[in-house]
């Protein structure tokens, strides 16, 4: 007889996920060779710890303590791009600015991209079947409270200029409930950060306008102006352009506003 | 084969500087890190400073931060390093390395004495 | 600055296997490699294993390291009066932007 097994709403673990982490790291620590002492054993057995034989609906940031101990990875702190819902173009961004950084171009970050974990209580079993989905089942489960914990401390390390790219397709260009939007934004140090800069990626080609007047743009520069760091904004209209623009800077149609 | 071989060592009154040199053959210089090791007189192996391959990068031990200055030259396939307001605990054999693709160093040179004293 | 914790000396006699112990963090060992150096005075260090375990092509089987946690050791079986050196640890130290080497574990074959 099968073991009754918890059926989450979510789903389940990204297949092949010890394997994915571990080659991931190894590509990571190959590309970057300030990291090449990493040794990405001890970084998968630290992942592990996280989330193995822990209920998924109770996981919490201490327990991502020993693997946030990697986190010293030096990124300037003052070239930090953070996004909310236009997570492409932002990684699209970084590739050509190779001197900003995404939280996804840490190794945490890397690391976790796109993937889904979760185990199960009492047993060091990975569950492939099914993981809690943050709204249908509990919001402490291992993928959310990674995410939280690392988004925290990418934002704690920001200073000077912080760079932020929006979605102006969305309803809501700012989101209160976002990981930028919940967690970053209250985790910059006014004491190091000077200004935020956020970047409104328009969608349509036709869209010409002021995204940066947005009510939820207004909202996000109240909260930022409260907490003593000024803000900034800026209109991407044309964010083909802006890449292009990026990899292209002496180009002369590059003057102009994008 | 690989040849690290250091020179510039000697006698210096403390407050005074000296710059080592280290002239690397046997491997393409410019792919790899590079470092300076120390060993002071019945002491162990004390690690002082990196530089990384390509736009360099440096990196320095707390003890010597501000001091010395490690930098290369890889169209002259040499590492230096510049040292300034020597203390007598600088007195040592100072190593230079080269590092492997894991951060281990995989050669060493065969060392020059600095001895620092009034 | 703090570095790794080896014993100061270890002997055996001829033969026999020896263990050197390395203690060092989380900021270090813990999710670093770990390096083992031979250092014969007068001579240059010589790299005995690398990323924990691994040997560079020269170096005789009887050299072993390996990685638990926040520790590592060397182990040398069959030793040899040739073995007679300093044998150091390091690893990177996250914490220090650098290298920590061990305070070094002198081998006597008695």
């Known amino acids: 007889v099968p073991r009754w097994r918890q059926q989450w709403s979510g789903p389940g673990t990204t297949k092949r996920f010890p394997e994915t982490v571990l080659a991931r790291c190894v590509k990571y620590t190959e590309i970057h060779p300030e990291m090449r002492h990493v040794d990405c054993q001890s970084v998968w057995d630290a992942f592990k710890g996280a989330f193995i034989s822990k209920h998924p609906c109770n996981i919490t940031e201490e327990d991502y303590q020993p693997l946030m101990k990697l986190g010293t990875q030096t990124v300037p702190c003052n070239k930090i791009l953070l996004w909310s819902r236009i997570k492409d173009l932002a990684h699209q961004f970084t590739q050509v600015q190779r001197d900003m950084f995404t939280l996804e171009d840490t190794l945490l970050g890397y690391l976790a991209d796109d993937l889904t974990w979760c185990g199960e209580f009492n047993t060091s079993k990975i569950n492939y079947q099914s993981c809690p989905d943050w709204r249908k089942d509990c919001s402490n489960n291992p993928v959310s409270v990674f995410w939280k914990t690392v988004s925290r401390r990418f934002a704690e390390a920001a200073c000077d200029v912080v760079h932020v790219m929006l979605n102006g397709s969305r309803s809501k260009i700012f989101d209160k409930n976002s990981t930028f939007g919940s967690v970053e934004v209250h985790n910059l140090q006014p004491e190091k950060v000077q200004t935020l800069e956020a970047w409104v990626i328009h969608g349509g080609r036709e869209d010409s306008r002021d995204l940066c007047q947005d009510p939820t743009i207004k909202e996000l520069e109240s909260i930022i102006s409260k907490r003593n760091i000024q803000f900034s904004c800026k209109n991407i209209y044309r964010p083909d352009k802006f890449l292009q623009c990026v990899k292209n800077p002496e180009d002369s149609s590059c003057t102009s506003e994008i | 084969q690989v040849q690290l071989v250091e020179s510039g060592g000697g006698l210096v009154k403390p407050g005074g500087s000296l710059r080592l040199s280290c002239a690397a053959s046997?491997?393409?210089?410019?792919?790899?890190?590079m470092s300076w090791i120390r060993q002071a007189p019945g002491k162990g192996l004390e690690w002082v400073a990196s530089?990384?391959?390509?736009?360099?990068?440096?990196y320095y031990a707390d003890s010597v931060r501000g001091r010395f200055t490690i930098s290369r030259d890889n169209a002259k396939n040499s590492l230096y390093l510049q040292m300034n307001s020597l203390r007598a605990e600088d007195t040592a054999v100072y190593y230079c390395?080269?590092?492997?693709?894991?951060?281990?160093?995989?050669?060493w040179g065969q060392g020059t004495l600095v001895t620092v004293s009034s | 600055q703090a570095g790794l914790t080896q014993p100061p000396s270890a002997s055996g006699t001829s033969g026999q296997r020896v263990t050197i112990s390395c203690s060092g963090s989380?900021?270090?060992?813990?999710?670093?490699?770990v390096y083992w150096y031979q250092h014969l005075p007068g001579t240059a260090p010589k790299l005995l294993i690398y990323?924990?375990?691994q040997r560079p092509s020269g170096v005789p089987d009887r050299f072993s390291g390996s990685k638990s946690g926040n520790s590592a050791s060397l182990a040398i079986s069959g030793l040899r009066s040739e073995d007679e050196a300093d044998y150091y640890c390091?690893?990177?130290?996250?914490?220090?932007?650098?290298?920590?080497f061990g305070s070094g574990t002198k081998v006597t074959v008695l």
């Open positions: 530089v990384s391959n390509g736009r360099p990068t440096t």
């Open positions: 989380s900021s270090n060992i813990g999710f670093h490699f």
């Open positions: 390091a690893a990177w130290d996250d914490s220090l932007s650098g290298y920590v």
């Open positions: 990323k924990n375990n």
């Open positions: 390395a080269r590092e492997g693709w894991s951060g281990e160093f995989t050669d």
């Open positions: 046997g491997f393409t210089f410019s792919d790899d890190y």
